[in-house]
Interface confidence: medium
């Protein structure tokens, strides 16, 4: 009864502050929450990560842990503090009875508590054949010192550091935090214990079969000889990396997490903190032929999450399972029959498969890119990985139907050269989680902290939606989509771009009384239109006649249905220029597309008119896709007429800057 659709379980236990008469009672009305893995077999009851509020100091963490022990002892319970976290997340790891959870949730400073759970290596360990190392392929871009300025941390099993592929390239740290192996008949065998980590180290930086042959690596042991670890052990490993970074700042850091467990709020939070400290994290999407959003660290937005494809660009099937998919995957990479170092002997090679291998590929590519451009931020690196990927080569029929539109059709590739990408305006598409079906349900899509939201669209499989709008949240714009009565739910789709020194704002026009439709334009000097959104309160937008027409010579204008409010995203940035491109089809069609030409980047994608038979609009790479209801269910021809509206932008400033560098 594995709950494949199972949302992460959250048990909210109410605080009863009168008990124990706490000296530092929590703020009135706040509730600390308890979380645990949705997959029962992966749960580790009896060990809990107590996460404290963000500004909690180490001394307060220690005091809170001692208080828990004292109060537990008064009730006759033994507890053991296994670790006090600081540097990444404030909190502590405690071994205790689940009976004490209610007590622990009432302690001061407690934000939430998570039961520990298992994480697993994401390679398939069987049917491994002995094979010879691959021949050097001349057509591949392989600089001899690729990745030499970058340090890659590998959190995995132990490794065979004297293997010829990785000897002198991997430093084995003294970090080890692994659970006992399962089963009484288990015998540790060095070659088996080292198998997963050795192979991945070889894929990242191996002499013969490595992607980034110049990268140096450091290994931390968080997976045991059976490829199993814990969320808590992984957290302590990430904290170790952060402390190492603070003690001895080096060049760019890449952290490879070739493991997966159930959705974990605390593991995702730790990844977020490390990413915001400037570390690039790359993880396996998971091998469960499932939505990657149900797993961690794959579901952490700040992490680069990698699915696996084979040599034919098909998603990898692994026995009865296969690569994970969905909106939490950033891109795919080779992950089937990948040749790498075998721990059977110091010159042995072996083929392994899985999203671990795919993630190792991307970690190697990231190391190469960062070595060429050490100042790249995480957002810039992610955008470049997406930009240089092979587009639309994956056979999407392998994915469940409802996941196809959400799953990126991107296979990672090395850039043709490590320079010359600076002039490009980079954008990516970010899908929200599904809103759920309730009438007032909304879905929110967010960009990364150093990306600009240039447009916002929405999509509903049933077509019942009330559009979308850009709104400010915590000082940043977000994209919010609205479900309609009787709808099965909506997605919000954000177009997130790298636009240095940008100043963007949203201009709104309320529904027009006149029959000509609603219009809004960018009226500030120097501001250009990057995206149009429309939102309506009525349950069903009727047909809009006469059709909405954009007046000639007014490209900086959004137009829409007269019953909808229209929102224009207007940006000012050095050298930014944009143009509107439309593709209208008079007869009903399930899909209408319009693409930006070479040198221009799609920033906005919307549909005209916004009538109810339009399911929504979204960007796929540089193409704007507008989807409509099945033509057989659409009424008249005029009702079926749909126009896809793309806004294409480029930055002359970025182009100039890159030319000056050449």
């Amino acid at each position: 009864q594995e709950d494949e659709d199972g949302d992460y379980e959250e048990l909210v236990l109410a605080l009863r502050s009168e008990e124990d008469g706490l000296a530092e009672a929590p703020e009135h009305g706040t509730t600390a929450t308890f979380h645990r893995c949705a997959k029962d077999p992966w749960r580790l009851p009896g060990t809990y990560v107590v996460v404290l509020k963000e500004e909690t100091h180490l001394s307060q963490s220690e005091r809170t842990a001692r208080r828990l022990q004292a109060q537990a002892a008064r009730r006759g319970y033994l507890t053991k503090i296994l670790h006090v976290f600081h540097g990444l997340l404030p909190g502590f790891l405690v071994k205790m009875s689940g009976d004490l959870l209610e007590l622990a949730l009432k302690l001061p400073h407690v934000d939430y508590i998570e039961e520990d759970s298992s994480v697993f290596a994401q390679s398939i360990p069987w049917n491994l054949e002995r094979i010879t190392p691959p021949r050097y392929r001349a057509d591949e871009y392989q600089p001899p010192d690729g990745g030499s300025l970058v340090e890659v941390y590998l959190l995995d099993t132990s490794i065979q550091s004297d293997h010829r592929e990785i000897e002198g390239r991997v430093m084995v740290t003294d970090f080890e935090n692994v659970p006992e192996e399962d089963g009484t008949r288990f015998h540790r065998q060095a070659s088996k214990c080292d198998s997963h980590g050795t192979h991945l180290a070889g894929v990242v930086s191996g002499r013969d079969a490595g992607v980034a042959k110049g990268a140096s690596m450091r290994s931390l042991r968080v997976l045991n000889c059976q490829g199993k670890g814990t969320v808590s052990g992984t957290l302590i490993g990430l904290e170790f990396i952060r402390k190492s970074q603070l003690v001895q700042p080096v060049g760019p850091l890449v952290v490879l997490l070739p493991l997966a467990g159930g959705y974990s709020r605390v593991l995702n939070a730790a990844c977020q903190r490390l990413a915001r400290a400037g570390v690039v994290l790359v993880t396996a999407a998971g091998n469960f032929r499932d939505d990657a959003c149900l797993y961690s660290p794959a579901s952490a937005p700040e992490v680069i999450t990698v699915g696996a494809t084979n040599a034919q660009d098909q998603p990898v099937t692994l026995g009865t399972l296969g690569t994970n998919f969905g909106r939490c995957v950033d891109l795919f990479a080779p992950g089937e029959d990948i040749i790498g170092a075998s721990s059977d002997c110091s010159t042995c090679f072996v083929s392994q498969s899985g999203t671990s291998q795919a993630a190792a590929h991307v970690a190697g590519i990231a190391a190469m890119m960062l070595s060429a451009e050490p100042e790249l931020t995480l957002a810039e690196l992610r955008q470049r990985l997406i930009h240089f990927s092979a587009k639309d080569v994956i056979n999407e029929a392998w994915f469940p139907e409802d996941q196809r539109v959400l799953t990126p059709n991107l296979v990672a590739a090395l850039p043709p050269s490590t320079h010359g990408a600076g002039w490009q305006l980079f954008c990516r598409t970010v899908w929200s989680a599904h809103s759920g079906p309730t009438r007032m349900a909304t879905a929110v899509a967010r960009c990364a902290p150093d990306e600009e939201l240039l447009s916002c669209s929405s999509f509903s499989r049933s077509g019942k939606r009330r559009g979308e709008r850009m709104e400010a949240q915590g000082g940043k714009l977000v994209c919010r989509a609205h479900n309609a009565f009787g709808g099965e739910g909506v997605y919000a789709i954000a177009r997130c771009c790298l636009l240095p020194q940008a100043n963007c704002s949203v201009h709104t026009a309320p529904p027009a009384e006149a029959s000509m439709g609603t219009r809004v334009h960018c009226h500030q000097q120097g501001h250009v239109l990057t995206g149009c959104s429309s939102h309506w309160e009525v349950e069903d937008l009727g047909t809009h006649k006469p059709p909405v027409l954009r007046p000639r010579g007014q490209p900086n204008q959004c137009v829409g249905h007269r019953e909808a409010s229209i929102h224009a995203s207007c940006c000012h940035a050095p050298g930014l220029e944009c143009k509107v491109k439309e593709h209208g089809i008079p007869a009903p069609q399930e899909q209408v597309t319009v693409a930006c030409e070479e040198g221009w980047t799609l920033t906005g994608c919307s549909a005209l008119p916004g009538t109810s038979h339009v399911l929504g609009a979204y960007a796929v790479d540089n193409t704007c896709v507008v989807r409509s209801r099945d033509v057989s269910t659409t009424g008249s021809t005029s009702e079926g007429a749909v126009t896809a509206v793309a806004i294409c932008c480029r930055s002359r400033h970025l182009a100039q800057a890159s030319q000056e560098l050449q």
Epitope: Q1, D40, R43, V119, F120, N287, G319, T320, L321
Partner: antibody, heavy 126, light 112 residues
């Protein structure tokens, strides 16, 4: 030795109610198990009724069983099946089964009923 | 509702022969399929889990295969002791999907 024993079966009037109990020995319920009820009408096939998670007590039922059948876990070694508004079509041998998970790859697992009770016969008749 | 359909309802084969039983799910259940053997008046016994893995103590004459929607149980070198009714069962995501019955209708194997 691990075993399950069902009790509480017998003759019951139509529209009546009955509670069956499944008692485990040789093991106690942990979050690793689901305890399930399956029935078999005379001369017919097996019919899944539902399961309860021994970890958090969440219950799952066959679509036809929702509303009339309730599974609960009164202790760490007993599971009950409460049946209401019984009809002649509910006449069957009722089995209690333990669903445990089997791991077959890194983190991947499936469930199967590895331990069954001998069954208890419920006859609905006036 | 997920429905499990088992064919044939009955099959008769001589000792030493081979029997093939099919089980079809109305939608994909990955490899979440088990096979059980039940002799008259007895409780069911687990033979195979995960579509293809033999349960402890089950002879290798029993072989399970398939994934997704189509599954097969093959019994080779039939013995008299194999005379029983065989059931397939899926428990794929019961918490989030609706089942009429997790079991197939059963296949009676007669050994001549």
């Amino acid at each position: 030795q691990e075993q399950l024993v069902e009790s509480g079966g017998g003759l019951v009037q139509p529209e009546g109610s009955l509670t069956l109990t499944c008692t485990a020995s040789g093991f106690s319920f942990t979050s690793d198990y689901y305890m399930c009820w399956v029935r078999q009408a005379p001369g017919k096939g097996l019919e899944w009724i539902g399961c309860i998670s021994t970890g958090d007590g969440s219950t799952y039922y066959a679509s036809w069983a929702k509303g009339r059948f309730t599974i609960s876990k009164p202790s760490s070694t007993t599971v009950t099946l409460q049946m209401t508004r019984l009809t002649a079509a509910d006449t069957a041998t009722y089995f209690c089964a333990r669903d445990r998970y089997y791991s077959y790859a890194y983190g991947a697992y499936v469930y199967a009923s590895d331990l069954w009770g001998p069954g208890t016969l419920v006859t609905v008749s006036s | 509702d997920i429905v499990m359909t088992q064919t044939p309802a009955s099959v008769s084969e001589p000792v030493g022969g081979t029997v093939t039983i099919n089980c079809q799910a109305s939608e994909s259940i990955r490899n979440y399929l088990s096979w059980y053997q039940q002799k008259p008046g007895q409780r069911p016994k687990l033979l195979i889990y995960g579509a293809s893995t033999l349960a402890s103590g089950v002879p290798s004459r029993f072989k399970g295969s398939g994934s997704g929607t189509d599954f097969t149980l093959t019994i080779s070198d039939l013995e008299c002791a194999d005379a029983a009714t065989y059931y397939c069962q899926s428990n794929y995501g019961i918490s989030s999907r609706s089942y009429v019955n997790g079991f197939g209708g059963g296949t009676e194997v007669v050994v001549k």
